[in-house]
Structure formats: C-alpha cells, structure tokens
Interface confidence: medium
C-alpha cells in the first residue's frame, strides 16, 4: 500500500535518465506564458520640469512563451549525487494573447540616463555626462517599442560616450541566446528529502550580492520540491530574477484538474522592512532611499545589476510601503493579480501550477548637473513594467498524473 | 481658443487692498496651474504668484510675500489675486498666466518662468493717493 | 539674474538670434510684446516648444547655461520685445530677463 506508493514516488523523482521526474525536468512539459504589462508615462514633460508624481497607466499584457527550451549541458556527478544544466532563455511573442505588437510605443523612464546619473555620482563627471545626455537630444524619458524597451535597443546619449562602454540597453537584454547557470543541484540518489535543492550556482554556493545568511541560496529553483510536503512547511526557493532566496508559506487547498495541490504564497513577511521583521535586515543595503531601512516592499539589487539602481517589487507596489508608492500616480494593488503563488501536488512535491509576479523598477534623483535631472526635487523608484509568469498542468499531463500518482493513493 | 481675462484693476490708494480676477475659458482650467505676473511702466516682467491645478501648491514673488494671496475656483474657471497693504512700487500691468503644466513646481519655493504657454490682456493697476 | 541684450536688428528675410544667460544649464520660455503694457505671447516654452499658433520660424534651444530664440525669415510683424523667462532650480528663484527689443529695418 502506502510503502510501495512512497518507494514508488522516492524512485520517480530521482532526477536521472529513465524517471518521470528527470523527463520533465530536462524540459517542461507545461507551456509556460510571461505576460508583460508596461507602465505608460502619461506626463513625462510635467514630471521633468515641476518633479511632479508620475502618471502612470498600464499597457498589456504582451504575452511571450517562455522556457520551451531543454536544459543543456546536463552533467551527472555521481560522486556528490548532484546534477548541474544550464538553462537557456528564449521568448517567442505570442500576438494572439497580447493586447498589441512589439511595435507598441511606450513612454518610459530613459533607462541609460537614470542608469548613469546613478553609477556616477561624481559632480565632474556628471558635467560631462550632462554634455553628451544634451547632444545625443536625450531626455528623462523617452519612447521606445515594446521590443526594443525589453530585448534592447542602441541608446543615442550611452553611444557618444567616449570610453568602451556598452550602448545597447534593454530590460531583459541580452536574453535570448543566452542561458542561465550554471546550476548544480542535487539529483535526490542519496537523499530523495534533498532532491532539486541547489548546491551551487555559477560554481559558488553564496550570492555575494548581501551579506550574511541573505547571501546564501536556498532550496529548489521552485519548479519542484522534495516529494511529501507537509503544510507547515516553509518552502524555500532560489530566483535568479531577484537575485535572492525567498519563502513561500501554505495558503489553502486548491482543486487542480482533480489533482489535489497545496497552494503556497509568498507572505508579505517576506517583503517587510527589518523594523517589523528582523530577519530582512541583511537585504537593506542602503540607508538613504530605505528611509533607514524603514521602506519596505522594494528591493534593491543593484549590486546584481552592475550597479544599475534596479529596485524589484511585486506589481503595482503591492506589500510596499506608501513612501514609495506616494510619487506614483495610477497605481492599484491587489492580492490576487500581483501575488505570487505556487501550487504543489504534496505527493511529488512537483509545482503543477504558478504564477510568479514581480515589477521591475528604477531609481531616479535629482541631479544639478544634469539638466534633464536638475528640476526634480525628490527621488522616484519609477515602476518601467511588471509581469505575470504562468505555468500549468495541461490536461493530457493532469489525467496521467491522476492515474499514476493521486489515483493510486486514493 | 485659450482666452484669459483680467478684471478688478484701477485707481487704488497706497496702504489699501485690490482683487483681480483672472476668468479663464477654451481648456480645461482644473488640469493647468496659473498664476499672475506683473510690469512695471517701462520696466521689465516680475513674478507674483502661482497656484498648483487642485489648489496644493502656492507660490508668492519676493516683493509680495506676505501681502498676497492667490486662490482659484475650479467649478468657475476663476483665479484670484488679492493683494493689501498697497505701495507705489505695485503699479503696473497685472498679467494672468497659464502654465502648460499642472504644477508649478514641487515643494520649491518659486513658480517657473519658463513653463508659461498662455497670457492674458493684462489689467492696469495705478496706486496712488 | 537673466542677461540677454537690449536691442538686435536684422532685415527681413533674415535669421535672428537672441540669447538668454542664466546661472546654470537651465529651461526658458521666449514671451513677445508689441509695445509696452500690451499683451503678451508665449512664442516658445519650456527651450524648445512651440504653441501650436506660433509660426515655424520661430525656435528655441540651449546651450549650457544659455538659452537661444531663433527666428528664421524674421517679417515686419516680428518687431517686438521678447523677455525671456526661466527658473534656477539651484537656487529656487524665477527670473525674467530685462527684454531685447526686435528692430526689423
């Protein structure tokens, strides 16, 4: 009975050649969507010269299918029962399930000028920078196309710069052909309460983006756990895109196609300031635009960023603190469209449904030499997009996996 | 078309009180800051003061701090400017001004002249006993 | 303080350029006056927008700390002051320049 089910499930989640768990593993039979929405700038001109809050109004979705590529370099280690893969990122514009084109003009914060003005504090050197910004007819904001604000674009002011420095900018550039990794986690063989749990990432087993424990990678990469998860668990996980480990705790019970799912959801604990939760104090790096660590709800990961002041929330400031949503207009959080959840089956441990949200914002202040920079009178964490990242179970997979699995122990 | 019209000017007394109306028309008033500047016979164009579209943000001339006060009337369409404790030196052309923005400025101490896209006629105020 | 000069001249048909100095890299707005007291047009806003009723000819740049109206093909109904309009965010003053008297020969 119960023995054979659980010895059955020890050994499919293996991840190694011949289980079920290694064939899904390698590549996602789930289709996986990343939907984009783009915070239009409504008043770029009224922002630039009175520093008034920003309008802002947003536009999508924009739909991508995402992570249909197998993971590559796949490299059993036998000897410390880990598994290391590459995986590579690609996006195919899905214009059935998205609002418009990626010739879509969107107004936007100048993502190279803020970037800039950031990086290179130094009064002398801003005079110069305020030069080139002028010539190169560059402003706060400027107008880009969907694919050139997220896959990249030659930026004019970046290009007069007289030194090697990289003029194409883009959210997500570069992105396609390219792979995240290298990963190496272990395979389960040993131990199947270990399975899918990273060991290292890019050959280290800490981020050496924050300090102490907040360095360390923890748990899976999210698209499953170890097998028999309990509801008072913390499930841990690793995302890359946030460049931190985050947690997620039991929400509910969720019917999915027949399958029965734990739904987990990341806490608003997780996005908290260190005032109310001590444990986040490590993921302050700054004490200026965290009001002395007293904001919460954003994240800043420029350190992960080449010192681009990327500030990453969930959508539409959800959890965030008003301080720094009070300089944004058109804003309306809300639990269920911006929360990330994750829905998995407690038997395999296996995540047959989620979504995972998340906003991605950048930092502007006031620069008096920079002209396009020197009338704002306070600092903006300006939202440029969020998006909704989705995956579930299709039907074919949800009738075998009640068959084989929730079937048999029912 | 954007119209601005001034009204209120005048023979006033030095030491009293004067009331200029600005009534505008042709846009929609409640999305656009005003304010009024001011000229002197043969002189050049002084600032005054300025009100942010919801009536926030208000902003006075050096030369006036403390004896003007600016207001508006979104449901009229209507900004007003009183000014007391009359002195020669408040004799001229009073200029209604429209900003192309819904605020003059934020949390600064002063309006932008540069940020001016529509004026009125103007209305002549003399001080004088 | 706002320097720009007191008079230019130019024939019709020609380019003229007033200049407008401030403290620091700034925006400007130019405003025409036909005669003393009399009403006031914005003719650019912000250095470089034009109201939709103002001719092509006329244009607005910056240079630094400097700011520049140019009229293209100046006409007879051109003559005028222009004062020129900024605000230092430095320092949080507005300023209006003394005005450049437009004479078309």
């Known amino acids: 009975g119960d023995m054979l089910i659980q010895k059955t499930i020890k050994k499919e989640v293996v991840l190694e050649e011949g289980t079920i768990a290694f064939k899904n593993w390698v590549k996602t039979g789930t289709e996986i969507y990343r939907q984009f929405w783009i915070f239009d700038v409504q008043n770029p001109q009224e922002v630039m010269m009175n520093s008034s809050n920003i309008q802002v109004k947003q536009r999508g979705p924009y739909t991508y299918r995402v992570r249909f590529l197998a993971k590559e370099n796949i490299t059993q280690d036998p000897k410390d029962n880990t598994v290391s893969f590459l995986q590579p990122n690609g996006a195919i514009f899905e214009p059935s399930l998205s609002v418009g084109t990626e010739a879509d003009n969107f107004t936007v914060l100048n993502l190279a000028v803020a970037a800039a003005s950031h990086i290179y504090p130094n009064p002398f050197v801003q005079v110069v920078l305020n030069s080139l910004i002028n010539k190169s007819k560059s402003s706060m904001f400027q107008v880009r196309t969907l694919r050139e604000l997220l896959w990249g674009y030659t930026d004019p002011f970046l290009s007069l710069v007289p030194y090697p420095v990289s003029t194409r900018v883009g959210m997500f550039y570069p992105y396609n052909n390219t792979a995240d990794g290298v990963y190496k986690v272990f395979n389960g063989k040993d131990s199947i309460s270990k399975v899918a749990i990273i060991d290292t990432y890019k050959g280290k087993r800490n981020l050496s983006y924050w300090e102490s424990y907040c360095d360390m990678i923890n748990g899976t990469d999210a698209a499953s756990f170890p097998p028999f998860v309990e509801k008072s668990q913390v499930l841990q996980f690793f995302s890359s895109d946030i460049c931190r480990s985050i947690y997620a705790v039991f929400e509910s019970d969720v019917n999915l196609k027949g399958i029965p799912v734990y739904r987990f959801v990341l806490p608003s604990k997780a996005f908290a300031s260190p005032v109310q939760n001590p444990d986040n104090h490590c993921f302050c790096t700054e004490k200026i635009i965290s009001k002395n660590c007293t904001s919460y709800g954003v994240l800043d990961i420029s350190k992960c960023k080449e010192g681009k002041p990327v500030y990453i929330s969930l959508p539409h400031f959800l959890y965030a603190s008003p301080d720094v949503s009070e300089t944004i207009d058109g804003l309306n959080p809300n639990e269920e469209e911006h929360r990330t959840y994750l829905d998995i089956e407690p038997i395999t441990g296996f995540t047959l449904q989620f979504a995972k949200r998340l906003q991605v914002n950048l930092l502007v202040k006031p620069s008096n030499k920079i002209q396009v920079l020197k009338r704002l009178k306070r600092n903006y964490i300006v939202p440029i997009l969020w998006l909704n990242e989705t995956g579930t179970i299709g039907d074919e997979k949800a009738k075998m996996f009640r068959s084989q699995v929730t079937g048999k122990i029912n | 078309a954007v119209t601005l019209d001034e009204s209120g000017g005048g023979l006033q007394t030095p030491g009293g009180a004067l009331s200029l109306v600005c009534k505008a028309s042709?846009?929609?008033?409640?999305?656009?800051?005003m304010g009024w500047v001011r000229q002197a016979p043969g002189k050049g164009l002084e600032w005054v003061a300025g009100?942010?579209?919801?009536?926030?943000?208000?902003a006075y001339g050096s030369a006036v701090k403390g004896r003007a006060t600016i207001s508006r009337d979104n449901g009229q369409s209507t900004v007003r400017l009183q000014l007391s404790n009359l002195r020669a030196e408040d004799t001229g052309v009073y200029y209604c001004?429209?900003?192309?923005?819904?605020?003059?400025?934020?949390?600064?101490?002063?309006?932008?002249?540069?940020?001016?896209?529509?004026w009125g006629h103007g209305t002549e105020v003399i001080v004088s006993s | 303080a706002l320097t720009q000069p007191s008079s230019v001249s130019a024939s019709p048909g020609e380019t003229v350029k007033i200049t407008c100095s401030g403290s620091?890299?700034?925006?400007y707005g130019w405003y025409q006056q036909k005669s003393p007291g009399s009403a006031l047009v914005t003719v650019i806003?912000?250095?470089?927008n034009r109201p939709s009723s103002i001719p092509s000819r006329f244009s607005g740049s910056t240079s630094g700390s400097t700011g520049t109206l140019t009229i293209t093909g100046v006409r007879a109904d051109d003559e005028a002051v222009y004062f020129c309009?900024?605000?230092?965010?430095?320092?949080?003053?507005?300023?209006f320049g003394a005005g450049t008297t437009l004479t078309v020969l």
């Open positions: 001004a429209k900003s192309a923005y819904g605020d003059w400025f934020y949390g600064s101490s002063g309006p932008y002249a540069d940020s001016i896209d529509a």
């Open positions: 042709g846009f929609d008033f409640s999305s656009y800051a």
């Open positions: 009100k942010a579209k919801d009536g926030g943000g208000t």
């Open positions: 620091s890299d700034s925006w």
């Open positions: 806003y912000d250095s470089t």
């Open positions: 309009g900024s605000f230092d965010s430095s320092t949080d003053s507005t300023a």
